[in-house]
Interface confidence: medium
Amino acid sequence: LPAQVAFTPYAPEPGSTCRLREYYDQTAQMCCSKCSPGQHAKVFCTKTSDTVCDSCEDSTYTQLWNWVPECLSCGSRCSSDQVETQACTREQNRICTCRPGWYCALSKQEGCRLCAPLRKCRPGFGVARPGTETSDVVCKPCAPGTFSNTTSSTDICRPHQICNVVAIPGNASMDAVCTSTSPTRSMAPGAVHLPQPVSTRSQHTQPTPEPSTAPSTSFLLPMGPSPPAEGSTGD
C-alpha cells in the first residue's frame, strides 16, 4: 500500500490501489479522498486539489463513503398502513414497516414497499401459523374436540369444555353447552340457573386440574333418570 506520508491527491504506483477512505479518480489519475456518510462530492479532485465534500441537503442522504455528485433522495413518506421506524437523515434513508395487524407483502432492501392486512380466520377455523412481519396468517379447520367462534388473526382452536352432561354438543365453531346434573333446588322466581361445566380448558378462564385421560368433548350421560335440562339455550 502507498506510504502513509502521501497526502491526497497523489499518483499511486502503477497498478496499485489507494488507501482506506480514498478512491482512484480515473480522470485525474490520482488517489483522492472519499466523502463520509452524510456528504457528497461537491467538487471532484484534480491533479492539484483534493475532493471537496459538502453536506447532503434536506430529504437526501448518503449511507456509505462515496464520491457521488449528488446525495440520494430519501424514500417517500410512509403510507397509512405503515409506521416510520427510521427517519430520513443525512446518513440514512427513511424506513417504513407495516403497522400491527399488517404484514409486508412486498419488501425492499430496507423496510417494506407494500403492506397487506393479516388474514382473519373465520369461525370454525383457528390460526395454524401466526403472521410475521413478512408472512401472512395460515388458518386451519378446527379439529374434532376443538372450536373457534371468532373471526381473528390471532385466535387458535380451543378445546371444548368437558361436561358431566352435554346439553348441546360442541362443533368446530361453537363450544359444548353443559347442563346441570344436580336436582333442581327451589329458586326465587325469575332466578336463572346457569349450567355448570365440570372443567374447562378455554383460554379465557382459569384452568382446573382434570384427568389426563379425559377426552376433549365428553358425552358423559347420567347413570339414572335426570331432571329436564335447564338453560338448554346454552351459556
Epitope: P14, G15, S16, T17, C18, R21, Y23, Y24, Q26, K34, A41, T62, L64, W65, N66, W67, V68, P69
Partner: nanobody, 117 residues
Framework: EVDLVESGGGLVQPGGSLRLSCAAS????????MGWYRQAPGNQRELVAA???????NYADSVKGRFTISRDNAKNTLWLQMNSLKPEDTAVYYC???????????RGQGTLVTVSS
C-alpha cells in the same frame, strides 16, 4: 448495487492459517479496487490488503509475506489467505469494493478472526 458477504472467519491457534472469502452478489469485473480491512475492539480500521482490477496486490507492512489477496472476476469472489497468524491479527475482517459505476465504497458485514491458544 452489489452486496458483499464475508465468510471463513473463526478461532485459530497462533501460527495457524485461515482463508477468508468475500462473495459479491453481482459482477465485480467493473470494480477497480477491492480489499480487506480489519478492526480490533478500540482500534482504528486498518487496511490489510487491496487488489486492483488488473490483479496487482498491495499489503500493509504488518501482514506482508504472511497474507495473500486474490480475486476471481468470473466467480465474483475475493479471497484472503492468512498464514502464520499472530494474536495481534485478531479482529473483525471486512471486505470492501469501490463501485465506480455507483460512486460508493461497498463493504460487507464482517467476519471475526480470533487468534488464541
Amino acid at each position: 448495487e452489489v452486496d458483499l458477504v464475508e465468510s471463513g472467519g473463526g478461532l485459530v491457534q497462533p501460527g495457524g492459517s485461515l482463508r477468508l472469502s468475500c462473495a459479491a452478489s453481482g459482477s465485480i469485473s467493473g470494480i477497480y479496487a477491492m480489499g480487506w480491512y480489519r478492526q480490533a475492539p478500540g482500534n482504528q480500521r486498518e487496511l490489510v490488503a487491496a487488489i486492483s482490477s488488473g490483479g496487482k496486490p498491495n499489503y500493509a507492512d504488518s501482514v506482508k509475506g504472511r497474507f495473500t489477496i486474490s480475486r476471481d472476476n468470473a466467480k465474483n469472489t475475493l479471497w484472503l489467505q492468512m498464514n502464520s497468524l499472530k494474536p495481534e491479527d485478531t479482529a473483525v475482517y471486512y471486505c470492501y469494493a469501490d463501485d465506480y459505476s455507483a460512486g460508493f465504497e461497498l463493504r460487507g458485514q464482517g467476519t471475526l478472526v480470533t487468534v488464541s491458544s
